[in-house]
Structure formats: C-alpha cells, structure tokens
C-alpha cells in the first residue's frame, strides 16, 4: 500500500528509538570508516526531518524514497573522497544505481582496529554516564565491522547488551557477572553475522530462486506439519525481509520482519506446535525465538514420495505445468521427512531430481528413464555422512586445537595462495564444527555440521572475493552454492604452487607472546603452522608435528625464563635452524 511519505510511514511503524537505531546501523554499514560523532549527527538530522514528515506528510521532500533521502545525506559527508576513494563516485549516480554502488563498496574486512574491551569499571562508568551514547556506540562498532549484520537482530543484541550492563554494573563482583555475558554476546554475534552473510551472498550471487529453495527446505524441516501453501507463504515473506536487509533497506526489513512474526504467531496452529513460548515474548525476543525454534515433530503418517514423484504417470505433466512449484513441493515433501539431512544436501537432491526430469521428460519413455531416480540419491546422502563420521572421529581423537591444526594443514595445501590470516580464521572456524556438532546424536549431526560448514566456507568466499588469489577458490565459490563444501573437500594438494621463500622474520617471536591469552597464543602458533606449510607444502604430518612440538616447547621455555627477550632471540635462532633441517628447507 502506497504512503504519501515513506519516511513518515516507517517512523510511525517502528517508533523513534528503533528508527534512530536502524538508521545508525544503515549508515555505519555503508560508511564504515566514518567517526561515530559524524554518524550520530547524520542520524539526528534524518530523525528531525522524519518528524517534520510525520507532522505533515506533504512537506517538502517527504515524498522522496528512503534511498534518495539516505543517499543524499551520506553524500553530504565532506571527507567522502579522501576517506573512501572511488566510493565517492557513487554520489554522481542517480537512484537506484547510487544505492547499488554503495552496496558494492561494503567491505567484509574493513581496515579497522581490533575492538579492545576496557576494564569493567571503565565500561560501567561510561554506561552510567550516558547510557544512550554507550548503546549507540555498540551498534555503530558492530555495524561498521559487520556490514551485512541482520539489522533487526542487532537491535535484539543491543537489548541484551543493555540488560547485561544494567544487571552487572550493580553486582558485587561486576567482572564475574559481566564478562561471561559479553563473551557470549560476542560469540553469538559473530555466528549471527556469518549466518546472515551467507543469506546475503545467496541472494546477491545466486539469486532469489536459490534463497527461496534454501528457505523451503529449512522451513519444511522446522514446520513439517504446515501445509505446502503455508510454507510457500512464509518463504515469500522471509525472502522479502532478507532481500530488504541485504539491500540496505533496514527500515522496511525490520518492519516486515515484525509483520512476519505477527503473522506466524497469529497462525501458529497451522504452522508449528513449538511456537507457543516464542509468541508470548516481546517483539525482538519473539522474532529471534521464532528464527531459532526447534523442529516440530513430523506428522504421524507420511507416505512414500514414490507415488507422487516417481510412479505417477503425471510426473512430467505436473513438472511442465509449473516447474518451480512442482520442484518446491518435492523439496517440501523431502525436507519435512528428513530433519536429519543438511539443507544443502536436500538442495543437492532436489537439483538431481530436476536434472533427471529435464532429461527424462524429453525422452521416448519418460517413466522408464526416471524410475530409478532415487538410486542416484544414495551416493549424495552417503558422502556427507561418511565425511562427518571420519571428521568427528578425528576430532574426538585430537581435541579442538589439534583438529583445527589438521584442518589448517589440509586447507593450506589445497589453497596455499590464500592469505595466512584468512586461512587461520577460516580453519579455526571449520575446526569448531567438532565441538559444535560431534556431540549430537547421528540424526542431528549432518544438519548441524554441513550447514555450519556452508556458513564458514562463505566467509572464505567473501574474503577471497575482495582480493582473489586462487582460481580454485573462485571456482568452488562461484560454480554452485550447494556444492561449495563438496568442491572444497574434493580439492587435493595444489601441485602448481611454488613454495614461498623462507623468511626467518616470519618465525621470529618476542616476549609479548607470553602475555597473550590462550586463544591469541594459539593463533600465533597456527599462523606459524600455515607459514611452514606454505614454505614446505609437501611436508609430512610427522614433520610438521615435530616442528610444532618444538615450537610449543620453545615458547613455554622462554616464557618461564628470567630474561625472556634474550631467550626468544637466542633459542629462536636455534629453533629456526632445527626446523629448516627437519623440513629439509
């Protein structure tokens, strides 16, 4: 329904607090280098303008689109050219090209300093001195580092962030109360950002059809009692929400997400029996809860799919009449019967079915041609099952850190051209699949593991896209969204790679390593491991293990020494020489 003033419409729907927060997120996600104060100023100007439009929708400029209003505002930033370079050229364009241009300049790996957590007392003082500014700064810092963070979900994180400070800054032991909560929010936030990044990549790189297929499969697993028409409606609405958020239309996205939550709760009887608790919560919690809700129980009696999708004489007729609807029904029926499969596996099965029908429905005897289509599914199902079994066994044998190291070596040998920080980050995250998923019973392992791996490999893909260095990575990332993981799994050692020149500086360590947290120390060691493999890609597991054991002993020894810096200098030289000898460098 058309509104005279879009900005007034969204301001009224969302309320001032959410409106301001979402505009701040939008601006910070576009102009990731701008100082906080500049963004606050821009947001206040937009908010004051929105209020004039609420008072009189016919007022000057109130009829302009949100993209026009926000783009014009962003283009008033004086330092645009010197801070952002060619992004300033976006301002010469008209809408909608200008917004597309801004979107293309979003940086998944912005050159921003690491967020350092101040002392708890310092944070609590800042929180009490100016709660509003403190929370805005949280939104700003997260949004600029995660330019695709799901905006309405970031509002939920901010609400939890505020609740943590409100509770813990009054506690007897502030740190004991606050720090675990902040750790949890940080870890959940990173996971939420990565999951949303995959949704946006799916929409932007593979199109709406790919996202809708993903959504049909996931919602059918989650709501197996819902009718196909109901699932289709939810998929359409969900696609609109994510298209808007991924496109920078955060006000519309948040508004539509609230409408979707309202619809789901009003119709929960025909959707899922698991929604009751979610639907009693306030809006932000409700939307989050619905997004995370457990799968409903399967209907008591579901027949074999063979009758409708293989044995029926009308298969080709039904397929020809409405291809995507028929394939959607196939995916819905398959997914609701298989909560034990990953979404990407279900999509591979649907793709195989589609390919078979494309071929067979043009054949002389279609039925004879597609009669054994489900036999083709067997290897597709068994491949991830076997892979997960093998890797969970390896994880249980090695523990998380050494399992990550095994993956570091594996992936560095596959794609040694990728930057070391990216290989470390991605392999560490791949390795977390063990503690995240291997504890689950078999029926939950595959959806946990393979769908998580899709999220992590997408991180590799978006980071690599910024600075492409490997044709193999590009190929696996762009050919097929659902086959990314099998594509990377199938990669062998890159025989074309010319080993990196040995540089002693890479393996020179200082006493500062002793004061690092365990996690940061692991990252240092894992960085060295990647560099070793880049120098000697053909090194055996045993050789690498020996060098890494020596390295661990060296760090431990020097961190206990009285003169740490001298120890690192002298013992470091010996370690480098011994490592070179061990690896035949």
């Amino acid at each position: 329904d058309a509104h005279k003033s879009e900005v007034a419409h969204r301001f009224k729907d969302l309320g001032e607090e959410n409106f301001k927060a979402l505009v701040l997120i939008a601006f910070a996600q576009y102009l990731q280098q701008c100082p906080f104060e500049d963004h606050v100023k821009l947001v206040n100007e937009v908010t004051e303008f929105a209020k004039t439009c609420v008072a009189d929708e016919s007022a000057e400029n109130c009829d302009k689109s949100l993209h026009t209003l926000f783009g014009d505002k962003l283009c008033t930033v004086a330092t645009l050219r010197e801070t952002y370079g060619e992004m300033a050229d976006c301002c010469a364009k008209q809408e909608p090209e200008r917004n597309e241009c801004f979107l293309q300049h979003k940086d998944d790996n912005p050159n921003l300093p690491r967020l350092v957590r101040p002392e708890v007392d310092v944070m609590c003082t800042a929180f009490h001195d100016n709660e509003e500014t403190f929370l805005k700064k949280y939104l700003y810092e997260i949004a600029r580092r995660h330019p695709y963070f799901y905006a309405p979900e970031l509002l939920f994180f901010a609400k939890r962030y505020k609740a943590a400070f409100t509770e813990c800054c009054q506690a007897a032991d502030k740190a004991a109360c606050l720090l675990p909560k902040l750790d949890e929010l940080r870890d959940e936030g990173k996971a939420s950002s990565a999951k949303q990044r995959l949704k946006c990549a799916s929409l932007q790189k593979f199109g709406e059809r790919a996202f809708k297929a993903w959504a049909v499969a996931r919602l059918s697993q989650r709501f197996p009692k819902a009718e196909f028409a109901e699932v289709s409606k939810l998929v359409t609405d969900l696609t609109k929400v994510h298209t808007e958020c991924c496109h920078g239309d955060l006000l519309e996205c948040a508004d539509d997400r609230a409408d979707l939550a309202k619809y789901i709760c009003e119709n929960q009887d025909s959707i899922s029996s698991k929604l009751k608790e979610c639907c009693e919560k306030p809006l932000l919690e409700k939307s989050h809860c619905i997004a995370e809700v457990e799968n409903d129980e399967m209907p008591a009696d579901l027949p074999s799919l063979a009758a409708d999708f293989v044995e029926s004489k009308d298969v080709c007729k039904n397929y020809a009449e409405a291809k995507d609807v028929f394939l959607g029904m196939f995916l819905y029926e398959y997914a609701r019967r298989h909560p034990d499969y990953s979404v990407v596996l279900l999509l591979r099965l649907a793709k195989t079915y589609e390919t078979t029908l494309e071929k067979c429905c043009a054949a002389a005897d279609p039925h004879e041609c597609y009669a054994k289509v489900f036999d083709e599914f067997k290897p597709l199902v068994e491949e991830p099952q076997n892979l997960i079994k093998q890797n969970c066994e390896l994880f249980e044998q090695l523990g998380e850190y050494k399992f990550q190291n095994a993956l570091l070596v594996r992936y560095t040998k596959k794609v040694p051209q990728v930057s070391t920080p990216t290989l470390v980050e991605v392999s560490r995250n791949l390795g977390k699949v063990g503690s995240k998923c291997c504890k689950h019973p078999e029926a939950k392992r595959m959806p946990c593991a393979e769908d998580y791996l899709s999220v992590v490999l997408n991180q590799l893909c978006v980071l690599h896209e910024k600075t492409p260095v490997s044709d193999r990575v590009t190929k696996c990332c762009t050919e097929s969204l659902v086959n990314r993981r099998p594509c990377f799994s199938a990669l062998e050692v890159d025989e074309t790679y010319v080993p990196k020149e040995f540089n002693a500086e890479t393996f020179t360590f200082h006493a500062d390593i002793c004061t690092l947290s365990e996690k940061e120390r692991q990252i240092k060691k894992q960085t060295a491991l990647v560099e070793l493999v880049k120098h000697k890609p053909k090194a055996t597991k045993e050789q690498l293990k020996a060098v890494m054991d020596d390295f661990a002993a060296f760090v431990e020894k020097c961190c206990k020494a009285d003169d740490k810096e001298t120890c690192f200098a002298e013992e470091g030289k010996k370690l480098v020489a011994a490592s070179q000898a061990a690896l035949g460098l």
Epitope: M298, D301, S304, P339, K378, E442
Partner: nanobody, 124 residues
Framework: EVQLVESGGGVVQPGGSLRLSCAAS????????MGWFRQAPGKEREFVAA????????YYADSVKGRFTISRDNSKNTAYLQMNSLRPEDTALYYC?????????????????WGQGTLVTVSS
C-alpha cells in the same frame, strides 16, 4: 538403540504361505517406518515392503504386490510380513529394518537399524 529380531522363516512349497515377524526392543517402533528387504544368494539386497509409522500407508515392490502384506502392531512393538502364493524366486534371507526418517520407503540408506535376517526357502 533399536534391536530387531526376525522370525517365521522356513522351507515352504511353491504356492504356500509364511508369516514373518520382526520384534523390536530398546525403543518403541511407533517413531519408525518399518521395512522388509531380502537378499538372494549372489544377488544385491532388494526392497520388499514398508509401512508408515502408524500403519496408514504401505508400499510394495512390484514383484510382491498382491501377494505380500505388511502390517504392524505398535502396542506389541512388532512388524509382520504375510507372504502368500510364494514362488521359488522369493527364496532369500529376509531382513527387517527400521528408519526414523524416510522419504522413499524403498531405499536401504534411509533405514537406521537392521535385523540379522531369517531365511525363506521356496522349493518343491
């Protein structure tokens, strides 16, 4: 964990009947699609029949349609295969299987638990 034990196999003349039973222990079978498969000497295991969780739907291989009937009694935690008009080509080791999730009923990879099998020999 579900343990499955088949019984009721034996030697029977062509045209005769047998009733196979599959008793489950360790878990209730009402959450599982139950299926029967068979393997003749030197051949691959093949699907025979399957039945949905509450028994509302059944599914048969073309070769046994109209001669075999699958049924289940969830209160007794048992599935059955009534085999009539038996033929020499029905001679095989018959396996009972339970699958928590199944889209196709006929695909062995969708079944989680298997019995040891009971031998059926059809011979004059």
């Amino acid at each position: 964990e579900v343990q499955l034990v088949e019984s009721g196999g034996g030697v029977v003349q062509p045209g005769g009947s047998l009733r196979l039973s599959c008793a489950a222990s360790g878990s209730t079978i009402s959450s599982y699609v139950m299926g029967w498969f068979r393997q003749a000497p030197g051949k691959e295991r093949e699907f025979v029949a399957a039945i949905s969780r509450s028994g509302g739907y059944t599914y048969y291989a073309d070769s046994v349609k109209g001669r075999f009937t699958i049924s289940r009694d969830n209160s007794k935690n048992t599935a059955y295969l009534q085999m009539n008009s038996l033929r020499p080509e029905d001679t095989a080791l018959y396996y009972c299987a339970a699958g928590r999730y199944s889209a196709w009923y006929s695909q062995s990879y969708e079944y989680d638990y298997w019995g040891q099998g009971t031998l059926v020999t059809v011979s004059s």
